[in-house]
Interface confidence: medium
């Protein structure tokens, strides 16, 4: 018996070939001996089977002795043994129809689980293997689960169903709803305007939801909601914004926030959450702000940074075009009785300067100037 695998919703063509290369009498039946279709001369006749409207043949092939059964919009329950009767002989074809569907939706939030469920006919024992867009292979039986979806899991998943040494391939497009970056860090001198951007890693026709930016300032004991907003068809509207600091938000995607000025009391970490309509859970992006201040008070030149800096970052004070006077893996450095000239405060990571602030030290009878 020949075995053919089909995909739910697809069209399958079961072949039946006579030894004579001419149009002769044939008919297709199912395992219950109910006639599906056949011919009467050059006419196609259909029987009372449940396939009725979905069954067809190719009249153009009859003259060559080929009498195929075409079944459109396959259903799992179409799985059966189909019998072609022609020239006093019977050809049997076993059709097994499989379906593979994602648990709820193909648009899933980062961190959520993807469950693929295989629909299969009774009595079958298929195995499934899926390959993710990043090349990860997952094997399973009737259900296949991937926990903690990542951004790289967005794209086409290719799943192969194996049964009786035959295989059928499914392609499922999965969209992982996430921000392009899980975390970002902004370095600013005190007083500078700060731009935060939260680009999404996906595009959809309509995007509706609501979001909020919570901020944990380094100096504060608790976090504070800085802004709440709504998203309707990719249009952003601010619902509420704190009075201090007063963030401004762009009206279009990507989500864009402007902090009027970087201040030590704002330095810290924020968490932007976005709840999308008809989705359980939220998208998250962490954003960090590091603020630098260089000051001269009496005979002490000080450079400080506030915010989440890693222990490997180096803070240095140096006179322009000279070696660093002081460099420490700390959040404050100072020089007593600094020489007159343009001093630079540098925050660097493995030699790469992340933030720089200049302060002009005048001869002792003058007051300092900050450019």
């Amino acid at each position: 018996k020949k075995v053919v695998l089909g995909k739910k919703g697809d069209t399958v063509e079961l072949t039946c070939t006579a030894s004579q290369k001419k149009s002769i009498q044939f008919h297709w039946k199912n395992s219950n001996q109910i006639k599906i279709l056949g011919n009467q001369g050059s006419f196609l006749t259909k029987g009372p089977s449940k396939l009725n409207d979905r069954a067809d043949s190719r009249r153009s092939l009859w003259d060559q002795g080929n009498f195929p059964l075409i079944i459109k919009n396959l259903k799992i329950e179409d799985s059966d043994t189909y019998i072609c009767e022609v020239e006093d002989q019977k050809e049997e074809v076993q059709l097994l129809v499989f379906g593979l569907t994602a648990n709820s939706d193909t648009h899933l939030l980062q961190g959520q689980s993807l469950t693929l469920t295989l629909e299969s006919p009774p009595g079958s024992s298929p195995s499934v293997q899926c390959r993710s867009p990043r090349g990860k292979n997952i094997q399973g039986g009737k259900t296949l689960s991937v926990s903690q979806l990542e951004l790289q899991d967005s794209g086409t998943w290719t799943c192969t169903v194996l049964q009786n040494q035959k295989k059928v391939e499914f392609k499922i497009d999965i969209v992982v709803l996430a921000f392009q970056k899980a975390s970002s860090i902004v370095y600013k001198k005190e007083g500078e305007q700060v731009e935060f951007s939260f680009p999404l890693a996906f595009t959809v026709e309509k995007l509706t939801g609501s979001g909020e930016l919570w901020w944990q300032a380094e100096r504060a004991s608790s976090s504070k909601s800085w802004i709440t907003f709504d998203l309707k068809n990719k249009e952003v509207s601010v619902k509420r914004v704190t009075q201090d600091p007063k963030l401004q938000m762009g009206k279009k995607l990507p989500l864009h926030l402007t902090l009027p000025q970087a201040l030590p009391q704002y330095a810290g970490s924020g968490n932007l959450t976005l709840a999308l309509e008809a989705k359980t859970g939220k998208l998250h992006q962490e954003v960090n702000l590091v603020v630098m201040r260089a000051t001269q008070l009496q005979k002490n030149l000080t450079c400080e940074v506030w915010g989440p800096t890693s222990p490997k970052l180096m803070l240095s004070l140096k006179l322009e075009n000279k070696e660093a006077k002081v460099s420490k893996r700390e959040k404050a450095v100072w020089v007593l009785n600094p020489e007159a000239g343009m001093w630079q405060c540098l925050l660097s990571d493995s030699g790469q300067v992340l933030l720089e602030s200049n302060i002009k030290v005048l001869p002792t009878w003058s007051t300092p100037v900050q450019p």
């Epitope: 909601s225 914004v241 000025q261 201040l263």
Partner: antibody
């Protein structure tokens, strides 16, 4: 201690402009927002707008949007509020103010009386 | 804009008694457990003086005779016991949403 000292009284003709100053002392000027509020004689208080002195970002009440400009000079720790196309109903005392640790205005300037009269 | 309506417009209270001023906001000024309502006292020829912030927090240096309460849209300033020095105009102000707005004021007279 925190102090906000404003410029003196002004008399202006309708259609003219006025620029009121507010000099801050006793704290780091760039650390706090300066707000401007006005009060017509015997009337209530009306918020005009605000400025972040560090970056110069300013926001104002849409009622004054086209006529008001709020600026700050970090070198002199001074904030300015300029109101153009003056009308007689702009006659009021103009205050600058700063927040305390909470959300209210804990520090106020002494006020500047602006009289608009032909 | 959020409209704040104070009542009464004026009131006269005997020395040592309680003065109660209410402020009704056109929409809720609550967020995340806090009510963004402040109260000020103003005497003629002087700038306003902050008494209460975030509905019920007493500004430093303000006597405990002053207290604030309320949430959502309804707020109250209580002064008890009233002293002669309390004669002034009192304003509520919301710092929930731009533009910041003030109530029209309540004039307190001491009998």
């Amino acid at each position: 201690q925190v102090q906000l000292v404003q410029s003196g009284a002004e008399v202006k003709k309708p259609g003219a402009s006025v620029k009121v100053s507010c000099k801050a002392s006793g704290y780091t000027f760039t650390d706090y927002v300066i707000h401007w509020v006005r009060q017509a004689t015997g009337q209530g208080l009306e918020w005009i707008g605000e400025i972040y002195p560090g970056s110069g970002s300013a926001y104002s009440n849409s009622k004054f949007k086209d006529r008001v400009t709020i600026t700050a000079d970090k070198s002199t720790n001074t904030a300015y509020m300029e109101l153009r196309s003056l009308r007689s109903d702009d006659t009021a005392v103009y205050f600058c103010a700063r927040r305390g640790n909470g959300t209210g205005f804990a520090y106020w300037g002494q006020g500047t009386l602006v009289t608009v009269s032909s | 804009d959020i409209v704040l309506t104070q009542s009464p417009a004026s009131l006269a209270v005997s020395l040592g008694q309680r003065a109660t001023i209410t402020c009704k906001a056109g929409q809720s000024v609550d967020y995340d457990g806090d009510s963004y309502m402040n109260w000020y006292q103003q005497k003629p020829g002087q700038p306003p003086k902050l008494l209460i912030y975030v509905a019920s927090n007493l500004e430093s240096g303000i006597p405990a005779r002053f207290s604030g309460s309320g949430s959502g849209t309804d707020f109250t300033l209580n002064i008890h016991p009233v002293e002669e020095n309390d004669a002034a105009t009192y304003y509520c102000q919301q710092s929930y949403k731009d533009p910041l707005t003030f109530g029209q004021g309540t004039k307190l007279e001491i009998k």
